[in-house]
Amino acid sequence: IPTEIPTSALVKETLALLSTHRTLLIANETLRIPVPVHKNHQLCTEEIFQGIGTLESQTVQGGTVERLFKNLSLIKKYIDGQKKKCGEERRRVNQFLDYLQEFLGVMNTEWIIES
Amino acid sequence: IPTEIPTSALVKETLALLSTHRTLLIANETLRIPVPVHKNHQLCTEEIFQGIGTLESQTVQGGTVERLFKNLSLIKKYIDGQKKKCGEERRRVNQFLDYLQEFLGVMNTEWIIES
């Protein structure tokens, strides 16, 4: 798979492949995988990809299921790149406060918060 | 501050306090703080709170600015609790695939993706 494929297209294709291979993947129904108990997915990327690794190790490879796991590994690569960009630029307090305000604003409007 | 205050109310109050104390906080013009270069805030919580720590150590405490940093520390506590909940429940493959599909769906529709 060329890594040049836009990440948005990669995500779309992966969703389709996940749907296609669901029956094969759930064949190992006794396997236990960490499933986050909330919907703030971005906080849980580490556990999600650990789970994908566990699932991959228990799934017979070949054909397009291999493409599914390759795609997921490219998505992980993209996310790891995004995480690196969290601390790359050191800027003035002003810019930091803008970002903090934005973060709290998103938390206020978009996060699923259980008290 | 009672930790019993709902997190959603805490976030709202913190946004207001941040606005109130902005002038005081930006007084330190030479300070440099890491600012993420993308808008997927949840991926950067560690860096955001490190930045808050840096800012707190450089800010004269007292009055409601102290309350701002106390609030931010409670928000960090909440997020740390959410992160713990990422791996607490180890469930069947079926539930994991539901979560993965949801995660990719959110990534597809809500993330700010630069290719």
Epitope: E29, T30, L31, R32, P34, V37, T54 | K85, G87, E88, E89, R90, R91, R92, Q95
Partner: antibody
């Protein structure tokens, strides 16, 4: 745990686990049993969201439910036989391990 | 189901002696293994989780090790309060399964 004691063969067992200091909506509760002088057998659990998972060996006879307002988890098992004689424990699961256990309740199946 | 084979079934140790209990899984369990201690008439108590992490409040003389299918619990200096039954448990797959237990006695 409560509800133990003597149960007639073929009857239904009903046990209650009352939890204190833990919220059922953010904790998973398991049932585990131990026949006299023997090892431990995992029976099933109720997840924090109310979903259940059972040991396939006894799944057809077992039902786990809860009342979150009373902080209680219930176990119902039908068609009891002498081999169901055991100490029954409820336990909190965390990352797949059982870190808080009830004191246990003895169930004897006999006519 | 994953079978957990524990050995020995019973063990007698002197005060201060180092003892080891083994647990063999019928397939790889990726270190999803716990050890419990149970005293007569009491509930089991979690000692070790994740194959080698010590549960809070458990004395440091207890340690766990192993990977894949082979795991062990070590008590570095036997104490009178260590008497009891010890069980291993896997949580890699459903159903969670336990070893048959090891009875540890003081000589």
């Amino acid at each position: 745990e409560s509800g133990g004691g003597l149960v007639q063969p073929s009857q239904t067992l009903s046990l209650t686990c009352t939890v204190s200091g833990l919220s059922l909506t953010s904790n998973s509760v398991n049932w585990i049993r131990q026949p006299p002088g023997k090892g431990l057998e995992w029976m099933g659990l109720i997840w924090s969201n109310g979903d259940t998972d059972y040991n396939s060996a006894i799944k057809s006879r077992l039902s786990i439910s809860r009342d979150t307002s009373k902080s209680q988890v219930f176990l119902k098992m039908n068609s009891l036989q002498s081999e169901d004689t055991a100490m029954y424990f409820c336990a909190r699961e965390y990352y797949g391990y059982f870190d808080y256990w009830g004191q246990g309740v003895m169930v004897t199946v006999s006519s | 189901d994953i079978q957990m084979t524990q050995s020995p079934a019973s063990l007698s140790a002197s005060l201060g002696e180092t003892i080891s209990i083994e647990c063999l899984a019928s397939e790889g369990i990726s270190s999803y293994l716990a050890w419990y201690q149970q005293k007569p008439g009491k509930s089991p108590q979690l000692l070790i989780y994740g194959a080698n992490s010590l549960q809070t409040g458990v004395p440091s003389r207890f340690s766990g090790s192993g990977s894949a299918t082979q795991y062990s619990l070590k008590i570095s200096s036997m104490q009178p309060e260590d008497e009891g039954d010890y069980f291993c448990q896997q949580s890699y797959k459903f159903p969670n399964t336990f070893g048959a237990g090891t009875k540890l006695e003081l000589k």
